[in-house]
């Protein structure tokens, strides 16, 4: 019996087609992805093959103005239209709190939404009961397939699930659910979830009875043969893990942003054992036409977005200096504003010992692309912010050693004075440079804001200590020459859309007046 698994993960609000780098589509003839194009390919496969499942491994939420405006209603509507068979909860599904998940998505989805390792307690338990499931048995042709879900247990540090959801260890939570399915004579089981490729492989190795793992969170690109675009494969597709009980378990993921449709064919014997597995992600490029009815629906929903981008978010009573002349040479108040917004967006009081889990922000000055003039009645709109942050990136959470941070700050000024983009703006950090010293030895003082303290204060950076830092995904990926961050980071979790972070902060503050306050000094 043959099953075709079509899968997406980490789509992050890319409902419309995008450029090759998953930013806003500029030249339509070269654009990729989007739900209209995805639907064309899915329908083509559904017509050609008998047993097809369309699965999503989480993080549909967050990433473009679509999510900012529609808050998840767009996810339910278009996933219903594409007739997804199941979805796992990702960490970003909790970005607007549990209510922001229940109302727009859980109550509206016509497909099961899954996670076995999230347990509700207190008053939420009855409210959310039955709205998401640990597993769902689905009819596929004349057979049945069990889908069991899982979600990153780091979600409380990455999003806003509140205090009434407990995120358990994935493997510990999955095993009894898989055992239950086996007891119920369900002998074909897919683990669908959002914990990253390393955990996907562990699940394949450790959870007895799981036949296939379909993952997300780490934006992992797997491919067999010559890759069709810019993404470099982390391994073959499918990635085969030998389980502790000796089975070959295929593990798949399909990069991110709806650029590819994962395509995996699995052959099972009559006892539900995997005999063979093969496939590859399908690049959703312009050779695949956009479905006209879905496209018309997208255009209809788009109207509200255009109206939103010119509405006032808040006011500034000072000039927001985002000029290259400032942000690439010294502390600029636009950099301070953005870093303050980044920290504010990551406030999670999950431990009495810590006032927050992260206090530091770094931001490449070259990523700040425009100032905002306060003389337009102080008005700040989404459109204004899109000029400041035009690249459609995210503000991510990483863990780095102090020594790596020191290298990053040396790199920040290694060729100072040439208006290059690597000059770092900061939050929760006090840095002093001496430019008379030779490159690589110019940081004379580097103090960081404590987190394990009731009264935050600045202490010298410790080289061997591990620190959490919020930074643009561009830096996490080694952009602007920050290779040491990419090479030495200990953990990397994708965060929220950059403009969304700043716009939410401005809306919350209502009136802003960021200052230049001595975060960056020269001796």
């Amino acid at each position: 019996w043959e099953l075709t698994i079509l899968h997406t993960n980490d789509v992050h609000s890319r409902l419309e087609q995008t450029s090759e780098d998953s930013s806003k589509c500029v030249n339509a003839s070269r654009c990729m992805g989007g739900v209209a194009r995805l639907f064309t390919k899915v329908q083509q496969i559904r017509r050609a093959e008998p047993n097809v499942l369309l699965l999503d491994a989480g993080d549909q939420y967050q990433g473009t103005i679509w999510f900012t405006v529609y808050k998840g209603a767009e996810v339910a509507h278009f996933m219903n239209a594409l007739r997804y068979d199941a979805m796992a909860l990702g960490n970003h599904e909790f970005d607007n709190g549990v209510e922001g998940l229940i109302e727009p998505l859980l109550k509206e989805a016509k497909f099961p939404i899954l996670s076995a390792n999230i347990k509700a307690k207190g008053p939420l338990a009855s409210q959310i009961s039955g709205l998401y499931l640990p597993y769902k048995v689905l009819p596929v042709g004349d057979e049945v397939v069990g889908i069991v879900g899982y979600t990153s247990k780091e979600t409380p540090f990455l999003s806003n699930p509140g205090t009434n959801l407990v995120f358990e260890d994935e493997i510990t939570a999955l095993q009894p659910e898989v055992d239950k399915l086996k007891t119920l004579n369900v002998n074909k089981i897919i683990a669908l979830g959002h914990s990253g490729f390393e955990m996907d492989k562990l699940i394949a190795q450790k959870v007895r009875g799981v036949d296939v793992v379909v993952g997300g969170h780490s934006n992992t690109f797997l491919y067999t043969g010559n890759p069709p675009s810019k993404e470099v494969p982390a391994g073959k597709y499918p990635f085969i893990v030998t389980s502790d009980d000796g089975r070959k378990v295929p593990v798949v993921q399909a990069y991110a942003f709806g650029k590819y449709l994962g395509y995996l064919k699995i052959e099972f014997d009559e006892r539900g054992n995997v005999i063979s597995s093969h496939g590859n992600p399908i690049l959703l490029n312009s050779s695949i036409p956009e479905d006209p009815s879905i496209k018309a629906d997208i255009n209809k929903w788009r109207i509200k977005l255009d109206n939103y981008s010119t509405q006032e978010l808040g006011k500034t009573i000072v000039y927001l200096d985002g000029s290259s002349q400032s942000c690439r040479f010294r502390e600029c108040n636009m950099g301070n504003l953005i870093c303050d917004a980044m920290i504010n967006n990551n406030l999670r009081h999950t431990d009495e010992m810590f006032w927050n889990h992260v206090s530091m922000c770094i931001l490449n000055g070259g990523g700040i692309r425009s100032p905002i003039d306060e003389r337009n009645n102080g008005t700040i709109t989404w459109e204004n912010l899109a000029a400041v942050l035009p690249f459609g990136g995210t503000f991510d959470l990483v863990q780095l050693k102090g020594s790596t941070l020191k290298k990053a700050f040396e790199h920040s000024v290694h060729r100072y004075g040439q208006s290059t983009g690597e000059f770092l703006q900061v939050g929760g950090i006090h840095v002093v440079y001496d430019l008379s010293r030779k490159p690589g030895d110019r940081v004379v003082k580097l103090d960081v804001l404590c987190t394990k303290c009731r009264v935050p204060s600045y202490d010298p950076l410790k080289m061997d200590e591990v620190y959490k830092v919020i930074l643009p995904n561009f830096l996490a990926n080694g952009g602007d020459g920050f290779q040491m961050i990419k090479d030495e980071l200990l953990r990397h979790d994708s965060g929220d859309q950059d403009i969304n972070v700043v716009s939410t902060y401005i809306s919350k503050m209502k009136v802003i007046y960021p200052a230049v306050e001595g975060r960056i000094k020269f001796s």
Epitope: F111, G130, L138, P139, L181, L184, N185
Partner: nanobody, 127 residues
Framework: QRQLVESGGGLVQPGGSLRLSCAAS????????IGWFRQAPGKEREGVSC????????YYADSVKGRFTISRDNAKNTVYLQMNSLKPEDTAVYFC?????????????????????WGQGTQVTVS
């Protein structure tokens, strides 16, 4: 081989009663949410009544509330639908369905999600 077999259908006069049975073979109904659905000619299949395996909570469509009663006998691995005060509009093929997933009875009956196991159906005619 897993099977759901419905029985008890037939021809009955308006105001009459019937008791439908759904017997399972190949699996234990204790662990399943069970539903009765019906399909009249030219109409969509609709959920009539559902019962859970765990807490025996029940759900009834508005059109049958107060007239139909769902029950289960786990020892006999059978679920029943007692239908009283039957009306001509109750005429349909009645199907039994089962889902081992922990769905709510309401979600099962709507049905919100695809249901994996179905019987062949039994005809009920009220005239």
């Amino acid at each position: 081989q897993r099977q759901l077999v419905e029985s008890g259908g037939g021809l009955v006069q308006p105001g009459g009663s019937l008791r439908l049975s759904c017997a399972a073979s190949g699996f234990l109904l204790d662990y399943y949410v069970i539903g009765w659905f019906r399909q009249a000619p030219g109409k969509e299949r609709e959920g009539v009544s559902c019962i859970s395996g765990s807490d025996r909570s029940t759900y009834y469509a508005d059109s049958v509330k107060g007239r139909f009663t769902i029950s289960r006998d786990n020892a006999k691995n059978t679920v029943y639908l007692q239908m009283n005060s039957l009306k001509p509009e109750d005429t349909a093929v009645y199907f039994c369905a089962a889902d081992p997933s922990p769905v709510t009875v309401q979600a099962m009956c709507l049905p919100r999600f695809p249901v994996p196991y179905w019987g062949q159906g039994t005809q009920v005619t009220v005239s």
